[in-house]
Interface confidence: low
């Protein structure tokens, strides 16, 4: 089958340079897994001997034999054994090492359609222009920020191709990047050079703090000289506090002498004192909390006459090695409800988080779960993906623990937990979840939300889709179209207004014959290659009364991208005096291709096309 | 660049009323989250209160809900404060803040997560 063309990231008007071999084909010379390897998963690898080769069905082989498969045997495959290979690997969650990968990655030798069923780091090793076109490159790299990005070091050419085709897929041109990117490049976005550093520090910084390996230079030095230069987003040095460094926490090797003079003195002593003090802020929680536990509580014999017969005020006077040795975990297990209602110290929390990990090392039962209350603030998120929570009731008495707070870890996994048991987000589940976070559905990744039914777009108000970026909307849209597919013109538009960020051209043309009157805040919110398509007369028709705020907007996109795609004269009819049409005897040359990258079209000058016309006045004289 | 300018601060009774504004130029503020922070002398900025693009979903300190209403107009470019059954313990220098959208692994009371600042405007309540 012919793979698609290779294309140059940013190519100029030029003919992008043709070629169609995309994935390099390595004959790998294939050592078989080291013990290190098998003991990653506690599995020893079972010799293959041709396994694979013909079995009944590969998705029957256990874990331990598809552990060890060697290259060799994968060569032989068909690229249909392959991918089946590939996806019991994913489903049978084994760890493969960066050659197994690499090696799969080479045998799937045309671009694999469901991604979402292939080993995620699998993606890592496949070539990101096998997936041109908007859609493809978009479901690629939605499913590569989940990927661990850190399997390949810096310098590998698989992780240094993926950065400049994932710019390309998202639109960013220049070094201006939005948050709404940097969220979207996820891990990816720990590579990007200084330049994008310098001129996006205000929503790269806050990123670049939780990059796992160090920075390089050149994104060192940018960031010092952004820090130094005291803009957004922690602004000058001389105003920091503590909760600024840390939120800096990541950065801060790279501050160097000049900057931490300008920070005030105080503020550095009393950051250092807290740090040094409490080391949680730099580790995960759970490694300190359990091995200083375990030295402080020692398993010591309750003194007599305390023994515990029930959960009550009298618990809060007793030491924690106390508590330890008289409170029955079983007890406490069945008196839960009473916790909430006694004011115990987070230390003596702690002791009784202890003895129900001990009571369910395999995870709590949901009637326990119900009654945490405050103790599910002590929980980590390992601890909760060992739930299994079903009942609506359960999830709305722990929301209301954190209610008024952010949404934690705890909670997002609390929530994933919940939505993967039910299978889906049906509308009571979102009536829930937004009503306590009205950011909610656009916490969500385009994946997660093609689990919700059209059913459920009922529940959904416009403020819950106030954070929602356009990948977002790319996947609500459809939903809603279908929701309220059945309701009347005004009515309908009243509905589909908060998600036509996710809507194509044809939509817009057809909402631009319905004298819908749009306001400029929902129409700067279009998708802009969604806009550019659309006339003078259409965008007229779809803003009606609110066509004259085009003027405020013609700088911002996509007013300013759309104004670049149409001709001057037509702009001109409008009487808003709007500039930077195309000119008149200027030739629109519409190389989608290029297009497809720039966003803008090509121009030939009026030398060029004199020469167009003279050839075209020619063959008709002829 | 947005340019934030607050405005309407002033000295009022202990119970009374008021209504800050914080105007914006440089470019539309239907992108940006909108936050009011205010700060007492030798103090860190204190959050308010926040507001989502739309409008439609409002954030406030413990200290002020029920008392203080965040609201905005996207076509004026102005977002608003107002604050009622004000206390002494109100009085400081409010500001108004923007950032570029919400993020949720990022605090909206976290001063250090808005992108753009006002040059405040002194609020004092007198007993």
């Known amino acids: 089958m012919a793979l698609p063309t290779a294309r140059p990231l940013l190519g100029s008007c030029g003919t992008p340079a043709l070629g169609s071999l995309l994935f390099l084909l390595f004959s790998l010379g294939w050592v078989q897994p080291s013990r290190t390897l098998a003991g990653e998963t506690g599995q020893e690898a079972a010799p293959l001997d041709g396994v694979l080769a013909n079995p009944p069905n590969i998705s029957s082989l256990s874990p331990r034999q598809l552990l060890g498969f060697p290259c060799a045997e994968v060569s032989g495959l068909s690229t249909e054994r392959v991918r089946e290979l590939a996806v019991a690997l994913a489903q049978k969650n084994v760890k493969l090492s960066t050659e197994q990968l690499r090696c799969l990655a080479h045998r799937l030798s045309e671009p694999p359609e469901d991604l979402d069923a292939l080993p995620l780091d699998l993606l890592l090793f496949l070539n990101p222009d096998a997936f041109s076109g908007p859609q493809a490159c978009t479901r690629f790299f939605s499913r590569i920020t989940k990927a661990n990005v850190d399997l390949l070091p810096r310098g590998a050419p698989e992780r240094q191709r993926l950065l400049p085709a994932a710019l390309a897929c998202w639109g960013v041109r220049g070094s201006l990047l939005s948050e709404a990117d940097v969220r979207a490049l996820g891990g990816l976005a720990c590579d990007l050079p200084g330049r994008f550093v310098a001129e996006s520090a205000e929503v790269l910084l806050p990123r670049l703090v939780s990059c796992p390996g160090p920075l390089d230079q050149d994104q060192q030095e940018a960031a010092r000289a952004a820090l130094q230069g005291g803009g957004p987003p922690y602004g000058p040095p001389s105003t920091w506090s503590v909760s600024t460094m840390d939120a800096l926490r990541g950065l801060l090797p790279v501050l160097g002498q000049p900057i931490i003079r300008s920070i005030p003195q105080g503020i550095v002593a009393a950051w250092r004192q807290r740090s040094s003090r409490d080391p949680s802020w730099r580790q995960p929680e759970r490694t300190i909390l359990r091995p200083r536990f375990r030295r402080e509580v020692e398993k010591t014999a309750c003194p007599s006459g305390k023994k515990a017969r029930e959960i009550d005020e009298s618990l809060i006077f007793y030491k924690k090695w106390e508590l330890e040795a008289c409170v029955d975990a079983a007890l406490l297990a069945t008196q839960m409800d009473r916790v909430n209602a006694i004011p115990f110290t987070y230390e003596q929390l702690d002791v009784l988080k202890h003895k129900l990990d001990e009571l369910y090392p395999q995870g709590y039962p949901e009637s326990v779960i119900q009654h945490l209350g405050y103790l599910f603030l002590k929980m980590s998120p390992e601890d909760i993906r060992k739930w299994n929570v079903t009942s609506l009731e359960t999830l709305k008495a722990l929301l209301e623990v954190n209610k008024g707070h952010e949404m934690s870890p705890q909670v997002a996994t609390l929530i994933d937990r919940f939505v993967k048991g039910r299978g889906q987000l049906d509308k009571d589940t979102l009536d829930t979840l937004t009503a306590f976070y009205p950011g909610y559905l656009c916490s969500l990744s385009p994946e997660e939300l093609s689990s919700v039914p059209p059913s459920s777009i009922w529940a959904v108000r416009p403020q819950d889709l106030d954070t929602c970026d356009p990948r977002q909307l790319d996947v609500l849209y459809p939903k809603a179209r279908l929701a309220f597919q059945n309701m009347n013109g005004s009515e309908y538009f009243v509905k589909i207004q908060s998600f036509l960020g996710g809507a194509p051209t044809e939509d817009l043309k057809a909402l631009s014959q319905q004298n819908v009157s749009m306001d400029l805040a929902t129409f700067m919110k279009l998708r802009t290659d969604a806009v550019l398509p659309l006339t003078v007369a259409e965008v007229q028709k779809l803003l009606g009364p609110h066509v004259e705020g085009l003027k405020a907007e013609e700088r911002h996109r996509p007013v300013r991208d759309w104004i670049l795609r149409q001709r001057q004269d037509d702009l001109d009819t409008l009487g808003l005096g709007l500039q930077g049409g195309i000119p008149n005897g200027y030739l629109v040359l519409d190389l989608s291709m290029q297009e497809a990258l720039s966003g803008t079209p090509c121009l030939l000058g009026p030398g060029p096309v004199l020469t167009v016309l003279a050839l075209l006045l020619a063959s008709t004289l002829a | 660049q947005v340019k934030l300018e607050e405005s309407g601060g002033g000295l009022v009774q202990a119970g009374g009323s008021l209504r800050i504004s914080c105007a914006a130029s440089?470019?539309?503020?239907?992108?940006?989250?909108m936050g009011w922070f205010r700060q007492t002398p030798g103090k860190e900025r204190e959050f308010v209160a926040a507001?989502?693009?739309?409008?439609?979903?409002?954030y406030y300190a413990d200290s002020v809900k029920g008392r203080f209403t965040i609201s905005r107009d996207n076509a004026k470019n102005t977002g608003y404060l107002q604050m009622n059954s004000l206390k002494p313990e109100d009085t400081a220098v409010y500001f108004c803040?923007?950032?570029?959208?919400?993020?949720?692994?990022?605090?909206?009371?976290?001063?250090?997560?808005?992108?753009?600042w006002g040059q405040g405007t002194q609020v004092t309540v007198s007993s």
């Open positions: 440089g470019r539309s503020i239907s992108d940006y989250f």
């Open positions: 803040a923007a950032r570029l959208s919400y993020d949720s692994r990022t605090s909206l009371q976290n001063s250090y997560d808005y992108n753009y």
């Open positions: 507001i989502s693009w739309s409008g439609g979903t409002a």
